[in-house]
């Protein structure tokens, strides 16, 4: 960090590594949930149209998928992969595309993906020839 | 020899309007995203907005979205910030920094050559 910058405790805000080397934050498409015509097809553009910068450098970019009996929702955010999101672990935070993943949740069908690449999650991935890990 | 120079700070009455200035020299501005970054006394680094070097998409954080607008002027070599609607929690010093698009880190501890930073004072 530069020595005219202040370094402040507890600072999440940024991240360096053994050099000092400053993390920049991910670029993530951030609309939140929204209702999504995406079904039955490999893959699926989010129609988010906000990019936001993630408030921190840890961030990941993440897509979750849900459909039941009454409509099919696509959420966008931005999450710390250290921590679960939707009860869930951020298993593949480092890729750089979002593949999504089914995971089991009663009364829905529900996929999720995360990634560390700007803008991932803007191109959802559902195709079985990228999804080589089994679902939870 | 690389620098960033920020100026337009200064104090200004909530809900009023400030523009900032980063000129670049010593690296070619265009292959280059530049951000701005401010961090409030005694608080941590805040990624504000971003634009990248050529066609000029940008992005914001959401603290600042509506309100910021970021701009460049690739001819000049200049970085802007235009502050709007501003808010006592918009106070800090204000920096501009770049970034190799798609790369993850900066290439040193410098943060690829930070500027002194232009100080935003909001207050009634």
């Known amino acids: 960090i530069p020595p005219h910058v202040q370094k402040s405790v507890n600072n999440d805000m940024i991240v360096t590594d053994n050099n000092g080397a400053v993390k920049f934050p991910q670029l993530c498409k951030f609309c939140d949930v929204r209702f999504s015509t995406c079904d039955n097809q490999k893959s699926c553009m989010s129609n988010c149209s906000i990019t936001s910068i993630c408030e921190k450098p840890q961030e990941v970019c993440v897509a979750v998928w849900r459909k039941n009996d009454e409509n099919i929702t696509l959420e966008t955010v931005c999450h710390d992969p250290k921590l679960p999101y939707h009860d869930f672990i951020l298993e593949d935070a480092a890729s750089p595309k979002c593949i999504m993943k089914e995971k089991k949740k009663p009364g829905e069908t529900f996929f999720m993906c995360s990634c560390s690449s700007d803008e991932c999650n803007d191109n959802i991935i559902f195709s079985e020839e990228y999804n080589t890990s089994n679902p939870d | 020899e690389v620098q960033l120079l920020e100026s337009g700070g200064g104090l200004v009455q909530p809900g009023g309007s400030l523009r900032l200035s980063c000129a670049a020299s010593?690296?070619?501005?265009?292959?280059?995203r530049m951000w701005w970054v401010r961090q409030a006394p005694g608080k941590g680094l805040e990624w504000v907005s971003?634009?990248?070097?050529?066609?000029?998409?940008?992005y914001y954080a959401k603290s600042v979205g509506g309100r910021f607008t970021i701009s460049r002027d690739n001819s000049k070599n200049t970085l802007y910030l235009q502050m709007n609607s501003l808010r006592a929690e918009d106070t800090a010093v204000y920096y501009c920094?770049?970034?190799?698009?798609?790369?993850?880190?900066?290439?040193?501890?410098?943060?690829?050559?930070w500027g002194q930073g232009t100080l935003v004072t909001v207050s009634s």
């Open positions: 971003a634009i990248e070097p050529i066609g000029n998409r940008t």
């Open positions: 010593g690296f070619t501005f265009t292959e280059y």
């Open positions: 920094a770049k970034q190799i698009p798609g790369r993850k880190w900066t290439a040193n501890s410098r943060f690829d050559y």
